[in-house]
Interface confidence: medium
Amino acid sequence: ESLGTEQRVVGRAAEVPGPEPGQQEQLVFGSGDAVELSCPPPGGGPMGPTVWVKDGTGLVPSERVLVGPQRLQVLNASHEDSGAYSCRQRLTQRVLCHFSVRVTDAPSSGDDEDGEDEAEDTGVDTGAPYWTRPERMDKKLLAVPAANTVRFRCPAAGNPTPSISWLKNGREFRGEHRIGGIKLRHQQWSLVMESVVPSDRGNYTCVVENKFGSIRQTYTLDVLERSPHRPILQAGLPANQTAVLGSDVEFHCKVYSDAQPHIQWLKHVEVNGSKVGPDGTPYVTVLKTAGANTTDKELEVLSLHNVTFEDAGEYTCLAGNSIGFSHHSAWLVVLPAEEELVEADEAGSVYAG
């Protein structure tokens, strides 16, 4: 475990106070539990407007997700609620508290509020493998130009320490299966392939197991041949975003092109109530384009600061080269600022977080 990192198993509806800023707290909840995270103001002073973020995306309040300035509640938690949660100051985006939450398949036993007697029941002292950074494993496609080195990583933990093995397209994967071989770095839970070629394309699965269980993760490797083609944009980018009014948003667009690409960010607009012109071409405004002082890497990120309701809408990353154009789009939803968490319970009482 790293310095300043602790792992706690939490019982039903236990409220977890936030760690000191700069620390990351690792928390384990059972399926069906209420995840409650608390982030008191540092030093007990005024907090100011805050926003709760999961895996880099602002959380949308709902009947199940209750968001307040100092507290977050996720009711009836499931595996999908695992991830990295942080409470940030809305204006500065400074992280005040952050938590790594893991929701196990089995519901936690007992009704202990403090969670201190839960470790044996939920099996952390001895237990099945789990991903140590689940929020970092939701990206599945790795697109790489041919001849480069590739590293796949599946960082995991468990007790006893799990073993890791690798499959390619569902079959055991060993060094003799590819020219140039492979490097297995068990200490880093990684697979390394140097100088990849098109025949390396496929699905790579890490299998992490100990006597208590097994987990697996599959990545898809796409090797881009160095032949003339229009730009290739990474699948899933830019991603749809939901943001709270006044927060900052980043859209990312990953461009692969052997010929020098020209990248633009566009926002779709309406003209006289219409989104498209007479010829069917969408009306857009150019938000970001190449200039004398702009690198391709910078153009792959579109930053929106202090978003307003007018910023909501469709955004497009457009990449062109001498062969042709490619584009991917994403939507931004802007929600009103939620200053307080207010929930009426069954008795009709109201509390403010």
Partner: antibody, heavy 130, light 106 residues
Amino acid sequence: QVQLKESGPALVKPTQTLTLTCTFSGFSLSTSGVGVGWIRQPPGKALEWLALIDWDDDKYYSTSLKTRLTISKDTSKNQVVLTMTNMDPVDTATYYCARYHSWYEMGYYGSTVGYMFDYWGQGTLVTVSS
Amino acid sequence: DIELTQPPSVSVAPGQTARISCSGDALGDKYASWYQQKPGQAPVLVIYDDSDRPSGIPERFSGSNSGNTATLTISGTQAEDEADYYCQSYDFDFAVFGGGTKLTVL
């Protein structure tokens, strides 16, 4: 064995352009996953990464200095050249070139590139003064 | 970009274990390298890929990396280990160095 050596003027005047050359041996800049980078170190201060050039001619620049930097390579001569415009006394530093290895991995927003610098030149001190 | 934070200085008695930390957001998701720099000399790679040693680097140098912190450990520190140490990683296709730590062997 791998060797790198930086060359260029020891003294430049403010507003002038600095041109540094890194001449290397023991490896080829046409080998996949290999590149050459420039790092500088003002007297008594920390290392600061400036620019990288990959075996396949991809170029990366420090965000804070990108408007002033240009990196290029001559694979046949085993040389990498860095130019830095509009020099200022705060640019006084020892400038190092270094070989690096790069790889692709899964990052938070999809594939990202990682680096590790395994061989360094001896460095050349550049003073900016009128 | 990620920022890597190191303590400015660490002191250790000869023969004791020195630990130098390097912290950055989700640093454990990336690979960290460590460089040793003695006065008037160029940096030398002492640890790469979190915990691997290049040939010629003594076994007393080791490394780890998890969570938000990478750590360089020097077991049985010797007088010749007195130097500046820099951690290095990467983010969004950029290389990043820490601010450096001066290791003093008392």
